[in-house]
Interface confidence: low
């Protein structure tokens, strides 16, 4: 490494003295530091000798000598103090710009090392440095702010005590830029508002920004509202708020409100809808049909939306029947949003006894409102065939239950068979009007179909086949011998 003469690391001189700094090295060297215009380079040995014939406080600083041919060989430094009682500080810059998070150096250099224990940093106007600003003093570099924040942006002055008197530097403007500058953050509250005419309302438009230079306005439609601006400083951010307070709202207060905040970087906007109504309201709606049909064992969720103002105070789901035995506790949840509720009733693996009416009732200041769902269960057909002589003639009766009402088809097939389709059948009868024995709401339909045969034929099998949207079922009846008969179930009663 090069050698500096006189040897350092520090050199203290008086104003007006001649100072010569010589850099001794095997090759060419270069000086770095606050050189121009206060120094001259010796023409005899260009680059190696720095000279000033009349040292002033402005020569205070750190000087570095580096070998040109071999920068890796290192460099050597010396710090020069020109101690001038009239000038305690040498400012190397009037303005410093850094990016948030970096170290910010405020280069006010003390001209006399003896003063370094009484230095302090202030903001312009005699204000203290922010409590959250972390900084320290280096006699060679000045005041150093660690991890500068946008909020540290300010004009700073360096102070020290000289002979019991305060000596203050001129200001250094520190500008700390955001890593990614952005428009102010905004909030418009509430996000939706409903009021009855005559009620009070408040809409608050607020914006926060790291720098103080930004604006915020509240508009109704395209009209800018003249509302006082409240400013605050919280959590290292500037906050500006415009709050619209209405003691008794009227219809003309309704509309779309916009909160607009802007700075040099750009603008952000938030909107909300303010609705003024004549009176309280409670509207219940469902996107589902109020007439629900599901198969036994299926699950379903009944969903109702309520739009209400003011808040719903009471609500309840109730089962209205008709089956009250074996009732389980209704399981439901309610989701709340602003002026909107979603009521969900869970019906899991519904049983026969759970068909019927489900009633949601809700109440707010508008009064009570309700919605009723009718739940009908679908059942696969169940079939039973019997024989009976009627007026000396043989008649087969097919009793069928199920929902929706099953269709009935009779087939006569040769032989003792347990399988027969229309292609194999000797005769096929579709009973389009079976007798309805029972048709209660929410219950299975029970029907009866009659097949008058006259005389049962030996070695014939009669099938009653039934079908609905849930499944099919059939049963056969076989004449075994004259005077005797056998009624037998189909092997598969139910094929979904």
């Amino acid at each position: 490494a090069p050698v500096i003469e006189p040897s350092g690391p520090e050199l203290v001189v008086e104003p007006g003295e001649t100072v010569t700094l010589r850099c001794v090295s095997n090759g060419s060297v270069e000086w770095d530091g606050p050189i121009s215009p206060y120094w001259t380079l010796d023409p005899e040995s260009p680059g190696s000798t720095l000279t000033t014939r009349n040292a002033t406080f402005k020569n205070t600083g750190t000087y570095r000598c580096t070998e040109l041919e071999d920068p890796m060989a290192g460099s050597t430094t010396i710090h020069l103090y020109v101690k001038d009682p009239a000038h305690s500080w040498n400012l190397l810059a009037q303005e410093v710009t850094v990016v948030e998070g970096q170290e910010a150096v405020l280069p006010c250099l003390i001209t006399d090392p003896a003063l370094k224990d009484s230095v302090s940093l202030m903001r312009e106007g005699g204000r203290q440095v922010l409590r959250k600003t972390v900084y320290f003093f280096s006699p060679w570099r000045g005041f150093i702010i660690r991890k500068a924040k946008v909020l540290d942006s300010n004009t700073y002055v360096c102070k020290t005590m000289v002979n019991g008197r305060e000596s203050t530097s001129t200001g250094i403007w520190l500008k700390v830029n955001r890593v990614h500058p952005e428009p102010p953050q905004i909030k418009l509250e509430p996000s939706k508002l409903v009021r009855i005419r005559g009620e009070a309302a408040q809409i608050v438009c607020s914006a926060t920004n790291a720098e103080v230079g930004f604006n915020v306005i509240l508009k109704r439609g395209d009209t800018k509202l003249e509302i006082p601006l409240n400013s605050d400083f919280q959590d290292n951010y500037y906050k500006k708020v415009r709050a619209l307070s209405l003691n008794a709202v009227d219809f003309q207060d309704a509309g779309i409100y916009s909160c607009v905040a802007s700075n040099d970087v750009g603008t952000r906007t938030a909107t909300m809808n303010f609705q003024v109504v004549e009176s309280a309201y409670l509207n219940l709606t469902s996107e589902q049909s109020l007439l629900q049909e599901v198969s036994v064992g299926d699950s379903l969720i009944l969903t109702v939306h309520a739009d209400a103002y003011p808040s719903i105070q009471h609500y309840n789901w109730t089962y209205l029947g008709p089956f009250f035995e074996d009732q389980r506790k209704l399981e439901f949840i309610t989701q709340r949003a602003i002026y909107r509720y979603t009521f969900k009733l869970f019906l899991n693996r519904v049983k026969a006894s759970e068909a019927g009416q489900y009633f949601l009732m809700a109440q707010n200041k508008a009064g009570w409102n309700n919605l009723t769902f009718e739940l009908t269960l679908r059942y696969p057909p169940e079939v039973s065939v019997t024989w009976m002589p009627v007026n000396g003639s043989d008649v087969l009766f097919c009793d069928v239950s199920g929902y929706p009402q099953p269709s009935v088809t009779w087939m006569e097939c040769r032989g003792h068979t347990d399988r027969c389709d229309e292609a194999q059948a000797l005769q096929v009868w579709n009973d389009t009007h079976p007798e309805v024995l029972s048709q209660k709401p929410f219950d299975k339909v029970i029907i009866q179909s009659q097949l008058p045969i006259g005389t049962l034929k030996h070695n014939m099998t009669y099938f009653c086949k039934t079908h609905n949207s849930v499944g099919n079922s059939s049963q056969y009846f076989r004449a075994v011998s004259l005077g005797q008969s056998k009624q037998l179930p189909d092997e598969s009663l139910f094929t979904p």
Epitope: R195, E199, P310, S311, I312, K329, I333, T334, K365
Partner: antibody, heavy 118, light 106 residues
């Protein structure tokens, strides 16, 4: 934020009346139900009733019919509860609490202590 | 009126221990709320609509139940959880509260 500021402690004589106030801020006073709750020393909570300040509508726990009267002043966003014909049984801390809808008392006042003693 | 019976009346738990408080209603209720009250302070909503945590309540708290039986659980007791907890129903007026469970730290 929502705040309910109740009036201070009261020391009153048996047979007299007392009126407790509850000043609301941070929300729309007229559009939310204000409830009143009683808590006797070392005891649980007892619901007295509610008032809807928008129109003055009230609902009381039957136990407090004739004992408590709930009112509200929209202009000052203040709810009041008057307790009459006081006895030592009425010595308690009384809370006001606001309900925004649904099944919860969302914010409570700090409580007002009433001591009935001769 | 619906009477709410809370148990236990008092209990002590060590830090990290699981705590369960039960509340039984004299007739079926839709939802249960729970409030926390510390000495000399107002009750604070802690759990509402049976299982929803109020704003700012740590997720070590939970609530469950239906019909006439409800419970309140702290998965891992912490010192700051020492307080009195009340259950509260709103299925019918008059609104009623449980008698409270005083939870202390061991």
């Amino acid at each position: 934020q929502v705040q309910l500021q109740q009036s201070g402690a009261e020391l009153v004589k048996p047979g007299s009346s007392v009126k407790i106030s509850c000043k609301a801020s941070g929300y729309t006073f007229t559009s939310n139900f204000m409830h009143w709750i009683k808590q006797q020393p070392g005891n649980g909570l007892e619901w007295i009733g509610w008032i809807y300040p928008g129109d003055g509508d009230t609902e009381y726990n039957q136990k407090f019919n004739g004992k408590a009267t709930l009112t509200a002043d929209k202009s000052s966003s203040t709810a009041y509860m008057q307790l009459s014909s006081l006895t030592s049984e009425d010595s308690a801390v009384y809370f006001c609490a606001v309900n925004y809808g649904g099944y919860v008392l969302d914010a409570w006042g700090q409580g007002a202590s009433v001591t009935v003693s001769s | 009126e619906i009477v709410l019976t809370q148990s236990p009346t008092t209990m002590a738990a060590s830090p990290g221990e699981k705590v369960t408080i039960t509340c039984r209603a004299s007739s079926s209720t839709n939802y249960m709320s729970w409030y926390q009250q510390k000495s000399g302070a107002s009750p604070k909503p802690w759990i509402y609509e049976t299982s929803k945590l109020a704003s700012g309540v740590p997720d070590r708290f939970s609530g469950s139940g239906s019909g006439t039986s409800y419970s309140f659980t702290i998965s891992s007791m912490e010192t700051e959880d020492a307080a009195t907890y009340y259950c509260h129903q709103w299925s019918s007026t008059p609104l009623t509260f449980g008698s409270g469970t005083k939870l202390e730290i061991k």
